[in-house]
C-alpha cells in the first residue's frame, strides 16, 4: 500500500513539476527590467526565451520574437536546449511511469516489469528535474553577469549632460516556476525510485525442510536451503521492458514567432 | 467618432476643492489607460495625472501629487480627477485624454476651465 | 525629471515651404527593449486641445496628412511639415512619453511668413 502510494505521489508530484517546466520555457517573463531606480517607468521591458516584450503605460504590449537563430547569445540557446531536453525527458517520463503504475493494469504486466519502468521513469524525472533546474540557472548567472555589467557602465562617462539611461534586467518570474518545477520533478524522480525498491519482488524461496523425529534419530536434509538472493541467475525474472529502446515523436509548440499586441 | 468630454470646472477658492468628470464614448474605454493634462493661460501644456486601463496604478507628478487623485468607473465610462487644497497655480484648462500605442495621448477632450483665486 | 527643451519658439515660413522644428530631451527617450523612441508630437490650434500628429518619435497618426514627417534618435528629434498649407499654422509640442512623469516642450508657434 506504502508503495503504491509512494509511486502514486512521485508520479503527481513530477506531473506538477513538469507542467511547471513547460509552463516556464515558453513564459516571456524570464528576465524582467529592473525598477530600483526608476519605480513609476512608463515603459516596461521584460525577456523570455522566445521572443522579448514591451509593455507601456497605455497598456499597450508588443512582443518580438527572435528570429535569427545564429546570431543569439550561446547560452540562452544552451538554456533552450537544457528546457527542451527536460521537457522531453519529462514527457517520455510520465508516458514509462503511467504503465508502471501499480493501480493500473495491463494485461499479465509482472511486478519486476512495473519496477523497471518505475526505475527508468524515476531516473529519467531526475534528469529531467537537473536539466530544468541547470538551464533556469545558468539563465539567472548570466543576467547577474549582465546586471553587474550594465551597472558598472551606468556610473562611467556621465561627464556630459545627456544621460544615456542603461536598461538592467533582473530575475522574472519564469526562473522561480522553473526552479520550482525542476525540484519538484526532481523530487518526484527520487520518489518514484523509492517505489522501485518496494516494488521489486524478493524472490526468496525456500525448499521444503523436512524433520524426522522417528524415535531416537532424527533426520535432517542437507542442502535444502537455497536462497535466491538476487545476485545469481534467476531465470525467473524475464526482462520485458528495455528503458533504453523506447523512443518517442515529441512534438514541442514554442509561442508564436510573430509580432503580435 | 470618439468624444470624451469634461465637466466640473469652475471658480474655486483657495485651498478648496473641485472634482472633475470626463465622460467617454464611442470607444472602449475600459481598455484604455486616461491621463489628465492642463494648460495654464498662455503656458505649455502639463502632464497632471494617469490612470492604468484596470485601476491598479496611478501616476502623478510631484506638483499635485497628495493633492489630486485621478480615478475611474468602467462601468459608467466616466473618468474623475478629485483636486482638493488647491492654489492660485492650479488655475487652467483642464484636458482628459486617452493613451494609445507610444503612451501617446490619442484622443483628447475639449478641456473644462478651473479658476483658483479669492 | 526628464527636461525637454524647444526650438525654435516661433517660426514664419511661406506657404508651401518645408518648415522644420527641432526638440531636445535631457535624457535619451530610446527604450532597449524595441529599439523606439518614446517622442510624441503635438499640434494644437487656438482655442482647441491638442490633436497627436506623431508618435514613437516618427510614427504618424492614422488621418494625419502625410506632409508630416517626425524624426531622430535618443535625444535629439525634428518634426518636418514638408510643404506648409494655411491649415497648419498652429503651436507643435513635443513630449517625453517614456518615464513619468510625462514633460512637454514649451511648444513651438508656427505662422504664415
Known amino acids: 500500500m506504502a508503495v503504491t502510494a509512494c509511486q502514486g505521489l512521485g508520479f503527481v508530484v513530477s506531473l506538477i513539476g513538469i507542467a511547471g517546466i513547460i509552463a516556464a520555457t515558453c513564459m516571456d517573463q524570464w528576465s524582467t527590467q529592473d525598477l530600483y531606480n526608476n519605480p513609476v517607468t512608463a515603459v516596461f521591458n521584460y525577456q523570455g526565451l522566445w521572443r522579448s516584450c514591451v509593455r507601456e503605460s497605455s497598456g499597450f504590449t508588443e512582443c518580438r520574437g527572435y528570429f535569427t537563430l545564429l546570431g543569439l547569445p550561446a547560452m540562452l540557446q544552451a538554456v533552450r536546449a537544457l528546457m527542451i531536453v527536460g521537457i522531453v525527458l519529462g514527457a517520455i517520463g510520465l508516458l514509462v511511469s503511467i504503465f508502471a503504475l501499480k493501480c493500473i493494469r495491463i494485461g499479465s504486466m509482472e511486478d519486476s516489469a512495473k519496477a523497471n519502468m518505475t526505475l527508468t521513469s524515476g531516473i529519467m524525472f531526475i534528469v529531467s528535474g537537473l536539466c530544468a533546474i541547470a538551464g533556469v540557472s545558468v539563465f539567472a548567472n548570466m543576467l547577474v553577469t549582465n546586471f553587474w555589467m550594465s551597472t558598472a557602465n551606468m556610473y562611467t562617462g556621465m561627464g556630459g549632460m545627456v544621460q544615456t539611461v542603461q536598461t538592467r534586467y533582473t530575475f522574472g518570474a519564469a526562473l522561480f516556476v522553473g526552479w520550482v518545477a525542476g525540484g519538484l520533478t526532481l523530487i518526484g524522480g527520487v520518489m518514484m525510485c523509492i517505489a522501485c525498491r518496494g516494488l521489486a519482488p524478493e524472490e526468496t524461496n525456500y525448499k521444503a525442510v523436512s524433520y524426522h523425529a522417528s524415535g531416537h534419530s532424527v533426520a535432517y536434509k542437507p542442502g535444502g536451503f537455497k536462497a535466491s538472493t538476487g545476485f545469481g541467475s534467476n531465470t525467473k525474472n524475464k526482462k520485458i521492458y528495455d528503458g533504453g529502446a523506447r523512443t518517442e515523436d515529441e512534438v514541442q509548440s514554442y509561442p508564436s514567432k510573430h509580432d503580435y499586441v | 467618432e470618439v468624444q470624451l468630454l469634461e465637466s466640473g470646472g469652475g471658480l474655486v477658492q483657495p485651498g478648496g476643492s473641485l472634482r472633475l468628470s470626463c465622460a467617454a464614448s464611442e470607444f472602449t474605454f475600459s481598455n484604455y489607460a486616461m491621463s489628465w493634462v492642463r494648460q495654464a493661460p498662455g503656458k505649455r501644456l502639463e502632464w497632471v495625472a494617469t490612470i492604468s486601463s484596470g485601476r491598479s496604478s496611478t501616476y502623478y507628478p510631484d506638483s499635485v501629487k497628495g493633492r489630486f487623485t485621478i480615478s475611474r468607473d468602467n462601468a459608467k465610462n466616466t473618468l474623475y480627477l478629485q483636486m482638493n487644497s488647491l492654489r492660485a497655480e492650479d488655475t487652467a484648462v483642464y484636458y482628459c485624454?486617452?493613451?494609445?500605442?507610444?503612451?501617446?495621448?490619442?484622443?483628447w477632450g475639449q478641456g473644462t476651465l478651473v479658476t483658483v483665486s479669492s | 525629471d526628464i527636461v525637454m527643451t524647444q526650438s525654435p519658439d516661433s517660426l514664419a515660413v511661406s506657404l508651401g515651404e518645408r518648415a522644420t522644428i527641432n526638440c531636445k530631451s535631457s535624457q535619451s527617450l530610446l527604450n532597449s527593449g524595441n529599439q523606439k523612441n518614446y517622442l510624441t508630437w503635438y499640434q494644437q490650434k487656438p482655442g482647441q486641445p491638442p490633436k497627436l500628429l506623431i508618435y514613437w518619435a516618427s510614427t504618424r497618426e492614422s488621418g494625419v496628412p502625410d506632409r508630416f514627417s517626425g524624426s531622430g534618435s535618443g535625444t535629439d528629434f525634428t518634426l518636418t511639415i514638408s510643404s506648409l498649407q494655411a491649415e497648419d499654422v498652429a503651436v507643435y509640442y513635443c513630449q517625453n512619453a517614456y518615464s513619468y512623469p510625462f514633460t512637454f516642450g514649451g511648444g513651438t508657434k508656427l505662422e504664415i511668413k
Open positions: 485624454a486617452g493613451l494609445g500605442r507610444g503612451n501617446a495621448m490619442e484622443y
